[in-house]
């Protein structure tokens, strides 16, 4: 059994065959004698009953209203009525792009990670018996594939696979040739699996400072988009009016991860700022990483090995 048309709002391209199938079809077969009616309303017209005499392009079957093909003036609201059952659809018919093999507004966009498996199959169950050939195009160039009936691509994504893939079904009806197009815009991106965030540089940093001067402690990390980076210091963050957290800066890496840096600015350094831990932490669902800064008076530098200093 074909799936019924359950979406209440539908956009289609002019010139293509199209059908609406109501969702109480099994019920309709049980009640063969029940009167079943299709109606259309649009702007000026209220509920006009549809029948094959309404238009040579319209065909009515038990459960289906067919358009051969659908045209711009078919835009409007459609109703199916049977006893106390009513189903309504709003149909929007859009103009075909005559300069391309597909219409941009009818494209389904998908993001596929590189090396991930994807499969495109051109298959049309409703018009199956009428389809005499089906082709798959990439960026409007026909792909030469083995299976002409249901052309299929199965592969692990590579960057060169990016593009517009159009399945075009060619079918005959009443001596006329029609085609139906379905297009996917596939964008290939870097592997988006999460990394374990890491803070850059040594875990413990002694910073030589002078009293009364200012210092900027820079904390940098490689992290995922949803990860956070923050500073912890003193008994209670924010208790020292001379300490300010600057706005976090983020740059996206070519691999789709983020390079973040957050500066802690300490103004008018006093004795209370010396020899205490200023901790920078990066946190993610996968865990945390912390690095520490200790401010040391320049005069005391001789007591500490040179390799632990940062500027």
């Amino acid at each position: 059994a074909e799936s019924c048309t359950s979406r209440p709002h539908i956009t289609v391209v002019e010139g293509e065959p199209f059908y609406l199938k109501h969702c109480s079809c099994s019920l309709a077969h049980e009640i063969e004698t029940t009167t079943k009616s299709w109606y259309k309303s649009s702007g000026s017209q209220e509920h006009v009953e549809l029948n094959p005499r309404s238009s040579s392009r319209i065909a009515l079957h038990d459960c289906v209203l067919e358009f051969w093909p659908v045209e711009l003036n078919d835009t409007g609201s459609y109703f199916f009525q049977m006893k106390n059952y009513t189903q309504k659809w709003k149909l929007n018919v859009i103009r075909r792009n005559k300069h391309s093999c597909f219409t941009e507004r009818q494209v389904t966009s998908k993001i596929v990670e590189v090396k991930k498996f994807f499969q495109i199959t051109c298959e049309n169950s409703y018009y199956q018996t009428l389809v005499n050939s089906t082709s798959l195009y990439k960026n409007c160039k026909k792909l030469l594939l083995e299976n002409n009936k249901n052309p299929t691509i199965k592969k692990n994504a590579e960057f060169e696979d990016q593009g517009y893939y159009s399945c075009v079904h060619f079918l005959h009806h009443n001596g006329k040739l029609f085609n139906i197009t379905k297009t996917f815009n596939i964008t290939i991106v870097e592997d988006r699996s999460n990394i374990v965030p890491v803070l850059l540089g040594p875990k413990l940093n002694h910073v030589a400072v002078e009293l009364g001067k200012n210092v900027r402690l820079n904390c940098s990390a490689l992290l995922n988009e949803e990860d956070v980076i923050y500073w912890m210091f003193g008994e209670e963050n924010g208790s020292d009016p001379n300490i300010h957290e600057e706005k976090e800066m983020r740059i996206m890496t070519p691999e789709g991860k983020w390079h973040a840096s957050k500066v802690l600015r300490i103004e008018n350094i006093g004795e209370s700022n010396l020899n205490v831990l200023y901790n920078c932490t990066v946190a993610s669902t996968g865990g945390t990483d912390t690095k520490s800064f200790i401010l040391v008076r320049k005069a005391d530098m001789a007591d500490i090995p040179g390799h632990v200093f940062t500027r």
């Epitope: 799936s3 389904t108 991930k116 499969q119 495109i120 199959t121 049309n124 893939y165 379905k182």
Partner: nanobody, 129 residues
Framework: QVQLVESGGGLVQAGGSLRLSCAAS????????MGWFRQAPGKEREFVAA????????YYADSVKGRFTISRDNAKNTVYLQMDSLKPEDTAVYYC??????????????????????WGQGTQVTVSS
């Protein structure tokens, strides 16, 4: 609308086997690609295996390749996951999922959770060592 109900979970010893079933209601079952996902305690839900609408293509996570087999019976509206050589790390709640159906062409991204529109409630699988 597709409703999914999983069954067949339980407690099994390492090295043992289980067969999970996922029964679907709805007359369009044969139009949906189906997948199995699992979620271990404290971990994110992860892809296990998937099968396309025709049953012509199957796809597996590396961690289960060669041990698990997915199949479907469109006449019975059921998808199966045969799990052999089970390991303690296979312990999880196993979820069955169905993707959305599109007319005229199907793009199948089996590993992508967001591609699946319909989900079952899950069945617990516990593998003891």
């Amino acid at each position: 609308q597709v409703q999914l109900v999983e069954s067949g979970g339980g407690l099994v010893q390492a090295g043992g086997s289980l067969r999970l079933s996922c029964a679907a209601s709805g007359r369009t079952f044969s139009k949906h690609a189906m997948g199995w996902f699992r979620q271990a305690p404290g971990k994110e839900r992860e892809f296990v295996a998937a099968i396309d609408w025709s049953g012509g293509s199957t796809y597996y996570a590396d961690s289960v390749k060669g041990r698990f087999t997915i199949s479907r019976d469109n006449a019975k509206n059921t998808v199966y996951l045969q799990m052999d050589s089970l390991k303690p790390e296979d312990t999880a709640v196993y979820y069955c999922a169905a993707d959305s159906y599109t007319d005229y062409a199907q793009l199948w991204l089996p590993e992508l959770e967001s591609e699946y529109d319909y989900w079952g409630q899950g069945t617990q699988v516990t593998v003891s060592s």
